[in-house]
Interface confidence: low
């Protein structure tokens, strides 16, 4: 009896695992084996596919074959008993295009009101993703074990912390990887569950803010209790994404070690240009809080988004305001190399009623003023870039009296 070729061959590639599955054409024929050949682009000869020769089942693994994952290959299969079937050719494919991202490895650490998630690719030193290893982003689904209500968190990196959770509560989550550059979404990891710890005696510091004064950064935060000491640490935001190197460590800011106030001041030159993460921890000598939420801190924006400097020319019914570059210490103007918009607030000195003008221009007219009246003006700058949505603090208020009537020209 002639053997029929196997049909419906499926190629499944997950990370560096290459699996072939197919259907038997004739279930009634026993003791049939199956063999595959492969052919690379531009080659005429077929080569035996190692790992997929004389297979008795309908599945085989050819992961051991060292392929160029970006090169198209073609497969063919036949059935064998005493004789052989004709070859059945599988549509050619490129392994990288066909590959799926496998489930990532997930490791959880619990705090009282937070969970730290460490994520790494499921296949270490993967050949498939060798050129894309740093481009993995992850998304996760998290839920309280007791309720099952899911929350999705997109676009996270290899270390992520989820805050504002309840103490002594079991949370479950699953994570999948994505390579946005290649439009690939991976499969979910197994579900991992962890119980948050008993509520810590000391809460973490809150509302951390960075501002610039002279050539120093001023870091401020809020804390519930008095007589505490605080420490501040920093980390490059890039390292947060890619903790491959063992220099991935939070580092102390020495000027902010064991400070007794809810602020610390340190020189701007501590940080080279870049984006950093900052966190603060409180201690009362016996107990230590968990770390605060991490805040992102961009030196370019933080350092240079100073309040605008302006001059006022007073007329009888208006002010002309001329906005200049802010000054650093030493009276050097700061060069702003990104577009700003200006918010100008003005009010009559004897009243609290404020009016606001938003302008892109650096010369602004404030109209409809009363003659011989004192008005006060303050201004601040905003970046126009949505991603870096930052505002300077307001400048100090400047108060001027309008001129007598009929001097508007």
């Amino acid at each position: 009896k002639n053997l029929k070729s196997p049909q419906k061959v499926e190629v499944d590639i997950i990370d560096d695992n290459f699996i072939l599955r197919w259907n038997r054409s004739d279930e009634s024929v026993g003791n049939v084996t199956f063999s595959f050949d492969y052919q690379k682009t531009g080659m005429d000869n077929w080569i035996k596919l190692s790992g997929c020769q004389n297979i008795t089942s309908t599945k085989c693994n050819f992961s051991s074959l060292k392929l160029n994952v970006y090169e198209e290959i073609k497969l063919r299969i036949r059935a064998e008993k005493e004789n052989t079937s004709s070859w059945y050719e599988v549509d050619s494919f490129t392994p990288f295009r066909k590959a799926q991202i496998g489930p990532p490895e997930v490791h959880l650490e619990a705090e009282d009101k937070a969970i730290v998630i460490h994520i790494s690719p499921g296949t270490k030193d993967s050949v498939m993703w060798a050129l894309d290893g740093l481009s993995f982003t992850y998304s996760l689904v998290i839920w309280k074990n007791s309720s099952g209500v899911e929350e999705r968190i997109e676009n996270i990196y290899s270390r992520h912390k989820i805050y504002k959770l309840s103490p002594e509560t079991t949370y479950c989550l699953k994570v999948k990887a994505a390579l946005l550059t290649s439009w690939k979404i991976g499969v979910y990891s197994p579900v991992h569950c962890i119980k948050t710890t008993v509520e810590n005696e000391l809460p973490p510091p809150e509302n951390i803010e960075v501002s610039v004064q002279n050539q120093n950064y001023v870091l401020k935060w809020d804390y519930t209790y008095a007589n505490m000491t605080f420490q501040v640490q920093w980390l490059h935001a890039f390292l947060k994404r890619n903790p491959g190197n063992h220099l991935y460590k939070w580092k102390q800011i020495p000027d902010c070690e064991n400070v007794k106030t809810t602020q610390c001041v340190f020189p701007q030159n501590v940080f080279q240009k870049g984006i950093y993460l900052l966190r603060v921890q409180a201690s009362d000598g016996n107990n230590t809080s968990f770390w605060s939420e991490e805040i992102k801190f961009d030196t370019e924006i933080q350092a240079f988004l100073l309040p605008p400097v302006f001059n006022i020319r007073s007329l009888s019914d208006s002010f002309h305001i001329y906005i200049g570059a802010p000054k650093q210490s030493g009276n050097t103007p700061v060069i702003q190399d990104y577009p700003l918009i200006y918010e100008i607030i003005f009010w009559e000195n004897t009243s609290n009623a404020e009016r606001k003008i938003i302008e892109k221009k650096t010369d602004v007219t404030v109209p409809n003023l009363k003659p011989l009246t004192v008005y006060c003006v303050k201004a601040r700058a905003h970046t126009m870039d949505e991603k870096l949505n930052k505002s300077s603090v307001f400048s100090d208020a400047v108060c001027e009296k309008t001129k007598p009537g009929n001097t508007s020209k």
Epitope: H236, N245, H246, K251, Q252, I253
Partner: antibody, heavy 124, light 112 residues
Framework: QVTLKESGPGILQPSQTLSLTCTFS??????????VGWIRQPSGKGLEWLAN???????YYNPSLKNRLTISKDTSNNQAFLKITNVDTADTATYFC????????????????WGQGASVTVSS | DVVLTQTPGSLSVTLGDQASISCRSS???????????LEWYLQKSGQSPQLLIY???NRFSGVPDRFIGSGSGTDFTLKISRVEPEDLGVYYC?????????FGAGTKLELK
């Protein structure tokens, strides 16, 4: 003043386990950002970084020797240890321990103080 | 692993001469924090190495200013402006940007 001193068996036979101790003073492995590294130098040859351990017990091993190395510490006695299993004549070298502070604020050096070295010979 | 290639392998000088040692890396040594973890050590005969230069060009405390480190990316140089007797020994470059940390093979500085 920071000092480090290595001690070891001096001589051992192939397939045995080499145990080295680094006793240091002038700093503590309890301090944030502090680490100790082990480096070796075969006679008349170059230097090879083997492993290091951080204040928070994080460890790093050179992948080429990872399966044979174990680094540990005893902070209360200011000591760090390195074990190398299944030694061979190729492991004959002077073994140094060195202070390895976390590169960070202001002083971005990786190694700032070395021990005098402990000579180890593997011979049958 | 990152390979650091030092040239020359040995250098014969007269006291008071300038000496120059090159260290070339197989990959850029600028780390993602924009810092370059490239250091120079001197190992005198029978002694352990001592740190001279860190971060390409920063002199470690107590190191005389005749030692000058320079370079970026993959090419680095150590210059000794006027060689003195205590400068003789083997010089190693060392990188800690990539795992594993690696050393150059060394350059022996000796008298003519």
């Amino acid at each position: 003043q920071v000092t480090l001193k290595e001690s070891g068996p001096g001589i051992l036979q192939p397939s045995q386990t080499l145990s080295l101790t680094c006793t240091f003073s002038g700093f503590s492995l309890n301090t944030y950002g502090m680490g100790v590294g082990w480096i070796r130098q075969p006679s008349g040859k170059g230097l090879e970084w083997l492993a290091n351990i951080w204040w928070d017990d994080d460890k790093y091993y050179n992948p080429s020797l990872k399966n044979r190395l174990t680094i540990s510490k005893d902070t209360s006695n200011n000591q760090a240890f390195l074990k190398i299993t299944n030694v061979d004549t190729a492991d004959t070298a002077t073994y140094f321990c060195a202070r390895h502070p976390l590169p960070g604020y202001k002083d971005n050096y990786v190694v700032d103080a070395w021990g005098q070295g402990a000579s180890v010979t593997v011979s049958s | 692993d990152v390979v650091l290639t030092q040239t020359p392998g040995s250098l014969s000088v007269t006291l008071g001469d300038q000496a120059s040692i090159s260290c070339r890396s197989s990959q850029s040594l600028e780390y993602s924090d924009q810092y370059t973890y490239l250091e120079w050590y001197l190992q005198k005969s029978g002694q352990s190495p001592q740190l001279l230069i860190y971060g390409v060009s920063n002199r470690f405390s107590g190191v005389p200013d005749r030692f000058i480190g320079s370079g970026s990316g993959t090419d680095f140089t150590l210059k000794i402006s006027r060689v003195e007797p205590e400068d003789l020994g083997v010089y190693y470059c060392f990188q800690a940007t990539h795992d594993p940390y690696t050393f150059g093979a060394g350059t022996k500085l000796e008298l003519k």
